[in-house]
Amino acid sequence: IPTEIPTSALVKETLALLSTHRTLLIANETLRIPVPVHKNHQLCTEEIFQGIGTLESQTVQGGTVERLFKNLSLIKKYIDGQKKKCGEERRRVNQFLDYLQEFLGVMNTEWIIES
Amino acid sequence: IPTEIPTSALVKETLALLSTHRTLLIANETLRIPVPVHKNHQLCTEEIFQGIGTLESQTVQGGTVERLFKNLSLIKKYIDGQKKKCGEERRRVNQFLDYLQEFLGVMNTEWIIES
């Protein structure tokens, strides 16, 4: 029996839980959380999870809302693992250049760039 | 007259310069640079630009190869600016949840997730 839910399934389930518990989560009218002003989400993972921490500390726990925050903590763990893999493999310059080219190509086509 | 080239044009020009100077850049046979092992590039911007710094310090400067590294430094400046914008605006919880939902939605559909 797999002890871990695959990350892709975890994300789907978390989206559903987020929707389910939205009313409970927005109950605190005065709470203010930093929200990134652009859509390049991966650049902002640190701030997003800080915001989740703030929200968790202000939310009455119990039932499936706990499952929501547990899931978000597992997603953070996955992203932290991905960040660790950013510098794991030392490669020849040609391979670094191919990665750089791909990065710039994606930036060129997929990033939301405001001049 | 605009003093700055728009970031999107800068990225395109940099891709072209990268291609032009590839042979010069790969001349160092023994240099090894960390290469991320996944395609979620935005998580790895720090390591990518560290690699660029390593490469620049090992590359004979002059001519348009200098322009390449100048461009890359401007792209880094743009990304650093984007990172600053991750925590600039404090918003109500419902707005944070909208952003979080969008983040998870993008993760669900666009990220390359390996279990």
């Epitope: 794991e88 493999e89 030392r90 490669r91 020849r92 040609n94 391979q95 191919d98 990665y99 080219q101 791909e102 190509g105 | 590839r22 042979t23 790969i26 001349a27 160092n28 046979e29 023994t30 090894r32 290469v35 991320p36 092992v37 996944h38 395609k39 390359i112 390996e114």
Partner: antibody, heavy 117, light 109 residues
Framework: QVQLQESGPGLVKPSQTLSLTCTVS??????????WSWIRQHPGKGLEWIGY???????YYNPSLKSRVTISVDTSKNQFSLKLSSVTAADTAVYYC?????????WGQGTLVTVSS | SYVLTQPPSVSVAPGQTARITCGGN??????VYWYQQKPGQAPVLVVH???DRPSGIPERFSGSNSGNTATLTISRVEVGDEADYSC???????????FGGGTKLTVLG
């Protein structure tokens, strides 16, 4: 542990196109630290590099085979493929797929392809 | 394009030292990789970056590289070392991989 497995016909007729696929397991073909390569070995001879591909689709080919070779990658299936056109008896060889970091780390077991009518 | 030259064969008695060379123009400025291949099997890396051994490869295998010649040295040769040995470099002017022609190591006796 990354494992690679070649598949494709063992017999190809002269002038036709040789097509092989390599399936990668135990690791992602989208791993930025690897190129995915094809190498061949004629009977009783040394290793001959055919070409390699990056997950982004960038390809590099042996100049002596470049006009006949196409390597492609399918990240959704975790596979990469080799096509060698206009084959002759001189293309009879054991064909290996391999992962290429700074060196060839992991190899398939190889598949013998014979070109004969 | 870059060319690597290896002797077709080297013979050595068990317990002796075998030296297999790989010649190339200014090869000393390149990183050299050595592979061992036994009949019917895929090659296995025995030395990388001129002289580094991957885990699991005996200390008897060592490498050196300077000038126009790289050398794979196998000390205290054993019968099980009988195999083909190929050197490999990258041709950085073209991003291409280059193999030597291979050397058959025969262990006498």
């Amino acid at each position: 542990q990354v494992q690679l497995q070649e598949s494709g016909p063992g017999l190809v007729k002269p002038s036709q196109t040789l097509s092989l696929t390599c399936t990668v397991s135990g690791g992602s073909i989208s791993n930025g630290g690897y190129y995915w390569s094809w190498i061949r070995q004629h009977p009783g001879k040394g290793l001959e590099w055919i070409g390699y591909i990056y997950y982004s689709g960038s390809t590099y080919y042996n100049p002596s085979l470049k006009s006949r070779v196409t390597i492609s990658v399918d990240t959704s299936k975790n596979q990469f493929s080799l096509k060698l056109s206009s084959v002759t008896a001189a293309d009879t060889a054991v064909y290996y797929c391999a992962s290429l970091g700074n060196w060839f780390d992991y190899w398939g077991q190889g598949t013998l392809v014979t070109v004969s009518s | 394009s870059y060319v690597l030259t290896q002797p077709p064969s080297v013979s050595v008695a068990p317990g002796q030292t075998a030296r297999i060379t790989c010649g190339g123009n200014n090869i000393g400025s390149k990183a050299v990789y050595w592979y061992q291949q036994k009949p019917g099997q895929a090659p296995v890396l025995v030395v990388h970056d001129d002289s580094d051994r991957p885990s699991g490869i005996p200390e008897r295998f060592s490498g050196s590289n300077s000038g126009n010649t790289a050398t794979l040295t196998i000390s205290r040769v054993e019968v099980g070392d009988e195999a083909d040995y190929s050197c490999q470099v990258w041709d950085s002017s073209s991003d291409h991989v280059v193999f030597g022609g291979g050397t058959k190591l025969t262990v006498l006796g």
